[in-house]
C-alpha cells in the first residue's frame, strides 16, 4: 500500500503447491471405474494447482487392478504442464480385480524409491483413489503399518459409483478406504457419489495436501 | 492401437453350424468386456451379449439367450459367437465391440468403444 | 426393457447446416448413460458421444450431445460432407444395452 493509500501490489492467496513434497498417486484401473475420463480430470484439476518440478513438488503416478503399472515416476516430468500433459494421456488398464493392498505396498516400496526420483528428507504423500473393496484387504493393515512407518502421508478417495449403480450397501467398503487413510480420518479420508463427482473435492483435498508443508 | 479383427464373411444353409470370431490386439484383452451386436439387413443395430475373455463370464440379452452361443479362448485373445443351428433369419451382419465399462455384481454399464469390421453371415 | 425412439427418421439438409436429432427414452435413463453411434454404409458404428455429452476421442467439437432422464440431442453445428449418415442412440443403464431404430442424415 502506498504513502496514500492506494493498492500497488496485491499478492493473490496461496493456492498453488509451491512446497516441496513427493507425491504418488495410487489409482484403481478396474473396469468398474467408469466413466475413466472423470479420473484423468480429477488429475488435471489437482495437478494444475501444483508447483511441479525437481525442487518444487514431484508427481508419480501409479495404477493397479489385478497388477500394477508405474504411470509415470516422481522425477519423470520437471513441470506442470508436463504432468498435465502425461496424465491426461493415461489410460484405463482394465480388470475385474481390485488389489489395492498390492497397490499402495508397490507404491511404498517402488515408487518412494530414490531411483524413481524419491528425494530424502521430503514429505512423502500417496493419494488412493478406488471405487471397490480390495481382493487382498488381508494384507491391507500390514500394508498400512508400514507406510506409516516409513511416513508416508496417505489421502484416500473412495468412489461409491459401482455400489450406487448396483444398489449394494456402502459401509464395509466405506470403512476399508477410511483404514487406509492417515489420522486424523476426518481430514484424509473423502468419499464421492460417482466417479463424476470426483472433481467436486479437488479444492479441498489440494488445500489438505498443500497445509502438510504450511 | 486397438483393434477388433473379425473372420470373414459366411455362407451357410439352415440348420448348419457356425463360429465366427472376433481377436483383439492392441490392449490386454483379458481385462475388457467383448460385446456382440446383430444388425439384420436394412435394420438396426441388437445388443446380443457380452463375455469378459478373462474367465469367460458371460451374459445374454433375453431376446438371444438360448438362441447363440458366446465363448472365448484367453490364450489367443479371441472371442466367439456360435449357432447349433441356423435359420435363415439368422442372416446379418454382426459385428463385435470393446466394453468401456462394467458387467459385475449384477450391474451392467458401459459404452462400446472400439468395434470390429463386422462378419457378414447369410444364411439360404 | 427401455425402448428408444429416435426422430425425425430421416434429416435432409445441406452442408454447413445445423442438425438436431432427437432420442427419447421410454423410462428415465439412468445417470446419464446414453451414447451417440455413427454409421456409414458398409462400415462398422463409430462412438460419437458417451454419457450424454462427452465427445469420445478423436470426434470433431462440432459433435455435441445433451440431455438427462428421457429427453437427449445430438447436434452436429455445420454439416460436413463426411457426417452424411445413420446415427444411432444407445442407453446403457440397466444392465443391458438397447438402441434407436437410427436416424438418417441426408444429403438435401
Known amino acids: 500500500v502506498s504513502p496514500t493509500f492506494q493498492v500497488v501490489n496485491s499478492i493473490a492467496p496461496v493456492q498453488e503447491c509451491s512446497t516441496q513434497l513427493d507425491i504418488v498417486i495410487v489409482l484403481d484401473g478396474s473396469n468398474s471405474i467408469y466413466p475413466w475420463d472423470s479420473v484423468t480430470a480429477f488429475l488435471n484439476d489437482l495437478l494444475e494447482r501444483m508447483d511441479i518440478g525437481p525442487k518444487q513438488t514431484q508427481v508419480g503416478i501409479v495404477q493397479y487392478g489385478a497388477n500394477v503399472t508405474h504411470e509415470f515416476n516422481l522425477n519423470k516430468y520437471s513441470s506442470t504442464e508436463e504432468v498435465l500433459v502425461a496424465a491426461k494421456k493415461i489410460v484405463q488398464r482394465g480388470g475385474r480385480q481390485t488389489m489395492t493392498a498390492l497397490g499402495i505396498d508397490t507404491a511404498r516400496k517402488e515408487a518412494f524409491t530414490e531411483a524413481r526420483g524419491a528425494r530424502r528428507g521430503v514429505k512423502k504423500v500417496m493419494v488412493i483413489v478406488t471405487d471397490g473393496e480390495s481382493h487382498d484387504n488381508h494384507r491391507l493393515k500390514k500394508v498400512i503399518q508400514d507406510c506409516e512407518d516409513e511416513n508416508i502421508q496417505r489421502f484416500s478417495i473412495a468412489i461409491l459409483g459401482s455400489y450406487n449403480r448396483g444398489n449394494l450397501s456402502t459401509e464395509k467398503f466405506v470403512e476399508e478406504i477410511k483404514s487406509i487413510a492417515s489420522e486424523p480420518t476426518e481430514k484424509h479420508f473423502f468419499n464421492v457419489s460417482d466417479e463424476l463427482a470426483l472433481v467436486t473435492i479437488v479444492k479441498t483435498l489440494g488445500e489438505r495436501i498443500f497445509a502438510l508443508e504450511a | 492401437e486397438v483393434q477388433l479383427v473379425q473372420s470373414g464373411a459366411e455362407v451357410k444353409k439352415p440348420g448348419e453350424s457356425l463360429r465366427i470370431s472376433c481377436k483383439g490386439s492392441?490392449?490386454?484383452?483379458?481385462?475388457?468386456?467383448i460385446g456382440w451386436v446383430r444388425q439384420m439387413p436394412g435394420k438396426g443395430l441388437e445388443w446380443m451379449g457380452i463375455?469378459?475373455?478373462?474367465?469367460?463370464?458371460?451374459r445374454y440379452s433375453p431376446s438371444f439367450q438360448g438362441q447363440v452361443t458366446i465363448s472365448a479362448d484367453k490364450s489367443i485373445s479371441t472371442a466367439y459367437l456360435q449357432w447349433s443351428s441356423l435359420k435363415a433369419s439368422d442372416t446379418a451382419m454382426y459385428y463385435c465391440?470393446?466394453?468401456?465399462?462394467?458387467?459385475?455384481?449384477?450391474?451392467?454399464?458401459?459404452?462400446?468403444?472400439?468395434w470390429g469390421q463386422g462378419t457378414l453371415v447369410t444364411v439360404s | 426393457e427401455i425402448v428408444l425412439t429416435q426422430s425425425p427418421g430421416t434429416l435432409s439438409l445441406s452442408p454447413g447446416e445445423r442438425a438436431t436429432l432427437s432420442c427419447r427414452a421410454s423410462?428415465?435413463?439412468?445417470?446419464?448413460?446414453l451414447a451417440w453411434y455413427q454409421q456409414k454404409p458398409a462400415q462398422a458404428p463409430r462412438l460419437l458421444i458417451y454419457?450424454?455429452?462427452r465427445r469420445a476421442t478423436g470426434i470433431p467439437d462440432r459433435f455435441s450431445g445433451s440431455g438427462s432422464g428421457t429427453d437427449f440431442t445430438l447436434t452436429i453445428s455445420r454439416l460436413e460432407p463426411e457426417d452424411f449418415a445413420v446415427y444411432y442412440c444407445?442407453?446403457?443403464?440397466?444392465?443391458?444395452?438397447?438402441f434407436g431404430q437410427g436416424t438418417t442424415v441426408e444429403i438435401k
Open positions: 444407445q442407453q446403457y443403464g440397466t444392465s443391458s444395452w438397447t
Open positions: 423410462q428415465s435413463v439412468s445417470s446419464s448413460y
Open positions: 454419457v450424454a455429452s
Open positions: 492392441g490392449y490386454s484383452v483379458t481385462s475388457y468386456w
Open positions: 463375455i469378459y475373455p478373462g474367465d469367460s463370464d458371460t
Open positions: 465391440a470393446r466394453l468401456q465399462g462394467d458387467c459385475s455384481g449384477g450391474t451392467c454399464y458401459g459404452h462400446f468403444d472400439y
